[in-house]
Amino acid sequence: KELKVTQPEKSVSVAAGDSTVLNCTLTSLLPVGPIRWYRGVGPSRLLIYSFAGEYVPRIRNVSDTTKRNNMDFSIRISNVTPADAGIYYCVKFQKGSSEPDTEIQSGGGTEVYVLAK
């Protein structure tokens, strides 16, 4: 099946201190390789979360990503602050061994607006 990364929401609004879910689904897990969430684009983009076993405070996967056929890589960000505002991209990589992982497809992005309480 052809790989497609889908972020259904173009934007979400969340009040400071609340939590929000950023949705991302894949149509295929192949080629094997990690899925990562970034804020922003280009060389200065910020890695927010990687589905490769690392612990990140305030961020959790929504579904059980240990299922071998899981294609839901949505995340929940808790206790949102104004600094969390920006456009978030769900990105699928093909594994690299001697070389770095190769980005093969990105979702369309979801803009997070943080509203004052």
């Epitope: 094997v32 076993g53 059980d64 240990t66 299922k67 071998r68 056929n69 594994k95 001697s98």
Partner: antibody
Framework: DLQLVESGGGVVRPGESLRLSCAAS????????MSWVRQAPGKGLEWLAG????????YYIDSVKGRFTISRDNSKNSLYLQMNSLTAEDTAVYYC???????????WGLGTLVTVSS | ALTQPASVSANPGETVKIICSGG??????YGWYQQKSPGSAPVTVI????KRPSDIPSRFSGSASGSAATLTITGVRVEDEAVYFC???????????FGAGTTLTVL
């Protein structure tokens, strides 16, 4: 310290059943998929079954499908393998192993020996 | 099926390479597992093709390309004598497999 301790092995007759347990400690058990791997005497490693962190999804090698059942109780930090209709070919050391994010293994238990003999 | 040599030997200080073939780079991740005696607990020396657990010495490294994975031990020691199993996870079939094992003898 991370530990995986198997128990429940022993000597059984062909056709009988056995339930293996694996007690986990030193990590958040409910966050990890787990697997059972066995090693017959003088042979290599053979993956048998895996289970997702939440326990809803299970996976088996064809040769044990329908005879073996993997399960877990996250409230008890325990993994199980129910083995039915055992044959001499099931004689082996059985290991539980913690899975990495991409379903390889990073930690292994010490193993428990199962002997099927008449 | 994963294929690896039945045995390799080396003198202390030499570099040893064990090659495991038979996987598909597109759908497969590889790991390497050390077993010092039959029936003893395996120890993971490499997972995810090239990731070394924190308690494994840096002389162990892994790589993968094409349909093969390689375990390299740089400056092999007597205590590295063991059977090394390559393992693979296939994302196409959701199944794990192992090679038959390679006995490393340090002369």
């Amino acid at each position: 310290d991370l530990q995986l301790v198997e128990s429940g092995g022993g000597v059984v007759r062909p056709g009988e059943s056995l339930r293996l347990s694996c007690a986990a400690s030193g990590f958040t058990f409910s966050s990890y998929a787990m697997s059972w791997v066995r090693q017959a005497p003088g042979k290599g490693l053979e993956w048998l079954a895996g289970i997702s962190a939440g326990g809803s999804d299970t996976y088996y090698i064809d040769s044990v499908k329908g005879r073996f059942t993997i399960s877990r109780d996250n409230s008890k930090n325990s993994l199980y393998l129910q083995m039915n209709s055992l044959t001499a070919e099931d004689t082996a050391v059985y290991y539980c192993a913690r899975e990495t994010w991409n379903h390889l293994f990073d930690y292994w238990g010490l193993g428990t020996l199962v002997t099927v003999s008449s | 099926a994963l294929t690896q040599p039945a045995s390799v030997s080396a003198n202390p200080g030499e570099t040893v390479k064990i090659i495991c073939s038979g996987g598909d780079y597109y759908s497969t991740y590889y790991g390497w597992y050390q077993q010092k005696s039959p029936g003893s607990a395996p120890v993971t020396v490499i997972h995810s093709d090239d990731k070394r657990p924190s308690d494994i010495p840096s002389r162990f490294s892994g790589s993968a390309s094409g349909s093969a994975a390689t375990l390299t031990i740089t400056g092999v020691r007597v205590e590295d004598e063991a059977v090394y199993f390559c393992g693979a996870y296939d994302g196409r079939t959701y199944i794990n497999t192992f090679g038959a094992g390679t006995t490393l003898t340090v002369l």
